[in-house]
């Protein structure tokens, strides 16, 4: 076990700013909820503290929540491929830039990190040339999420990983619109961190609304699992 | 997702007592703060009171100290408002907050968990 992995072994409470500047449209959100890495489970909610959100809520999604990867669940005999809790608690930088397909695109830069006991996600985000009858700056949107495989390599010169995976989102009219995200995760600390072989992290989502609430908001329930690498010809032979 | 649920409002006399209690679920106690936030009519919701996770270190709003005392029960998932020596002016629905940053905001816009209040009048 890593020494970032024992933070992971109970609940552990996530905070999440953003800021946010799409086509000029300036927005802010705040998110706060919990993680179980045990189970690979996020439970969040996301108010936009600025008014009504200038884009769709699932286009940040990957930003708010595949950003806190180090609450994924990795299988015991993939412990040692978990770069994103073997950097905690000092944590890490994530960068993307994410292409919607047709349109604009999203830069985000993002530092996840304990702050105490809590796992803060701080993100920083641009968007530019998106079209402002669009299916982003339109909202022509379905407001929920599919599932998708993120694939992870090691990026040995940065000492850290990239990330590479390709979202689709539903759009009103029974068409999809992709979003291409093209992502970078370097340490902050100077600690070992652990670099993985190829796998990939198999991501659920569910998108809800609280009933209560008057603000612009979003719920997630999410479930994140890592795969893609088997057992050791040793384990076969147990 | 994190609900809330308040009880204990009613109606009491100046100088009386109340005890509101603030039921917790769908999210894991111990690692909320938790408060509560009062709205009169035609005013401004504002803070009253909270209590932060584990440790349980507390703040009051200066019009409440040494009348109200807030506590928490982390095995019942239950926060609890004494209030004593209550005035009229303290008439107003009051709504149990939380989040999960280690002290609840006193503002009431940067609070994401609310629940949907409960009435306390005191006549005079």
């Known amino acids: 076990m890593s020494k970032g992995e024992e933070l992971f072994t109970g609940v552990v409470p996530i905070l999440v700013e953003l800021d946010g500047d799409v086509n000029g449209h300036k927005f802010s959100v705040s998110g706060e909820g919990e993680g179980d890495a045990t189970y690979g489970k996020l439970t969040l909610k996301f108010i936009c503290t600025t008014g009504k959100l200038p884009v769709p809520w699932p286009t940040l999604v990957t930003t708010f929540s595949y950003g806190v990867q180090c609450f994924s669940r990795y299988p015991d005999h993939m412990k040692q491929h978990d770069f994103f809790k073997s950097a905690m608690p000092e944590g890490y930088v994530q960068e993307r830039t994410i292409f919607f397909k047709d349109d604009g695109n999203y830069k985000t830069r993002a530092e996840v990190k304990f702050e105490g006991d809590t796992l803060v996600n701080r993100i920083e985000l641009k968007g530019i040339d998106f079209k402002e009858d669009g299916n982003i700056l339109g909202h022509k949107l379905e407001y929920n999420y599919n599932s998708h495989n993120v694939y992870i390599m090691a990026d040995k010169q940065k000492n850290g990983i990239k990330v590479n995976f390709k979202i689709r989102h539903n759009i009103e009219d029974g068409s999809v619109q992709l979003a291409d995200h093209y992502q970078q995760n370097t340490p902050i600390g100077d600690g070992p961190v652990l670099l993985p072989d190829n796998h990939y992290l198999s991501t659920q989502s569910a998108l809800s609304k609280d009933p209560n609430e008057k603000r612009d908001h979003m719920v997630l329930l999410e479930f994140v699992t890592a795969a893609g690498i088997t057992h050791g010809m040793d384990e076969l032979y147990k | 997702d994190v609900q809330l649920q308040e009880s204990g409002g009613g109606l009491v006399q100046a100088g009386g007592s109340l005890r509101l209690s603030c039921a917790a679920s769908g999210g894991t106690f111990s690692i909320l703060s938790l408060g509560w936030f009062r709205q009169a009519p035609g005013k401004e919701r504002e803070f009253v009171a909270a209590?932060?996770?584990?440790?349980?270190?507390?703040d009051y709003a200066d019009f409440v100290k040494g009348r109200f005392m807030i506590s928490r029960e982390n095995a019942k998932n239950t926060a609890y408002l004494q209030m004593n020596s209550l005035k009229p002016e303290d008439t107003a629905v009051y709504f149990c907050?939380?989040?999960?940053?280690?002290?609840?905001?006193?503002?009431?816009?940067?609070?994401?968990?609310w629940g949907q209040g409960t009435q306390v009048t005191v006549s005079s």
């Open positions: 907050a939380a989040s999960y940053a280690r002290r609840l905001s006193t503002t009431a816009s940067r609070v994401l968990y």
């Open positions: 209590i932060s996770r584990s440790e349980g270190s507390t």
